[in-house]
Interface confidence: medium
């Protein structure tokens, strides 16, 4: 089978999943792409748990999640429910907001640098996190 | 060891589909994306698109969206590329490769099948 | 797409001589780049990873340099052997391109 008991080097176990952390930048729907090519997905935060944990290890940096509303509704990347699920936006926030003078409002939820969340132009180059189920994570170091 | 070994020389017609083979032996075949290349004879190195084996999740150049289909059977460790609509343009060496990776997303292709020449002729 | 600026596209050189081949990108690729090099009628072969890594077995005459959208592949005191076709390859985001080549040859 395709189960899997350890995460891939360099990615960090935390409660059944495992993490990428980046340390550049790329638009919204870059990032989103690079963790599809890692058989992964743009982290999914589903409780203050996990929230702490990415907070922990990203630190004060602008950094995506895989959150958005592009085509209407808030949804999350894997399919979890955004409604009934956790959540934790700034103040005022998401708004939508159009005075940023770039075209359009804001798509895209990244964590701030306090560690709560905001909606902002999908295009900005910010920091992101992969995340993928440790029962589908690969558990060999690559062969070269 | 690592291998790739991929199928024979294929003569195909015009507008007709094939189905060239890629088998992976040495490794966990489910943790590593298989890649695909073409090249056209004299020319360079064209990435057409990668398959995850592990979830079956694909990547395609566009330039190959409808021209290539990319599957892979995890019970045999054998990745397929299907390409249908042939013409002339599609007569070129087709490679599958392993998509290495290091520290988390540092990527390279670390093992090439030794290439399959299709002829579209009539 | 990111663009790929391979140069030169040949190059005819002598045994024992040191040669450079450059790889220009479109946009900041930080340093997700392969090099890899291709005899006549042969699979490619991967040289170097992420910019600078010498794939293993790799002889310690080629040397990989460069980050960000400039980036070279060093051959110091060429061989026999390493004459044939070397390509350059992104991989920040699909698609992941090759620069067009550069064929070595003997002169």
């Known amino acids: 089978g395709s189960e899997r008991t350890c995460c891939p080097v360099n990615w960090v176990e935390h409660e059944r999943s495992c993490y990428w952390f980046s340390r550049s930048g790329k638009a919204w729907a870059d990032a989103d792409n690079y963790c599809r090519l890692e058989d992964a997905h743009l982290v999914v935060v589903t409780s203050w748990e996990e929230q702490k944990f990415v907070q922990h290890h990203i630190g004060p940096v602008n950094t995506w999640m895989g959150l958005h509303d592009q085509n209407g509704p808030w949804k999350w990347v894997d399919g979890t429910d955004y409604e009934t699920g956790f959540k934790n936006w700034r103040p005022e926030q998401p708004d939508d907001w159009y005075g940023h003078g770039l075209g359009g409002g804001e798509d895209c939820a990244h964590f701030t640098d306090d560690g709560r969340w905001n909606d902002d132009v999908c295009q900005r180059p910010y920091r992101w996190v992969c995340e993928t189920e440790l029962d589908k994570a690969s558990q060999e170091p690559p062969l070269l | 060891q690592v291998q790739l070994q991929q199928s024979g020389a294929e003569l195909a017609r015009p507008g007709a589909s094939v189905k060239l083979s890629c088998k992976a032996s040495g490794y966990t075949f489910t943790n590593y994306g298989i890649n695909w290349v073409k090249q056209r004879t004299g020319q360079g190195l064209e990435w057409i698109g990668e398959?995850?084996?592990?979830?079956?999740?694909?990547f395609y150049n566009e330039k190959f969206k409808g021209k290539a289909t990319l599957t892979a059977d995890k019970s045999s460790t054998t990745a397929y590329m299907e390409l249908r609509s042939l013409t002339s343009e599609d007569s070129a060496v087709y490679f599958c490769?392993?998509?290495?990776?290091?520290?988390?997303?540092?990527?390279?292709?670390?093992?090439w099948g030794q290439g399959t020449t299709l002829t579209v002729s009539s | 797409d990111i663009q790929m600026t391979q140069s030169p596209a040949s190059l005819s050189v002598s045994v024992g001589e040191t040669v450079t081949i450059t790889c220009r990108i479109s946009?900041?690729?930080?340093?997700?780049l392969a090099w890899y090099q291709q005899k006549q009628g042969k699979s490619p072969h991967l040289l170097v990873y992420a910019a600078i890594n010498l794939a293993d077995g790799v002889p310690s005459r080629f040397s990989g340099s460069g980050s960000g959208t400039q980036f070279s592949l060093k051959i110091n005191s060429l061989q026999s052997e390493d004459f044939g076709s070397y390509y350059c390859?992104?991989?920040?985001?699909?698609?992941?391109?090759f620069g067009s080549g550069t064929k070595l040859e003997i002169k």
């Open positions: 390859q992104h991989f920040w985001g699909t698609p992941f391109t």
């Open positions: 490769a392993r998509k290495g990776r290091d520290y988390g997303t540092s990527h390279y292709f670390d093992y």
């Open positions: 946009e900041n690729i930080y340093s997700n």
């Open positions: 398959i995850f084996p592990r979830s079956d999740n694909t």
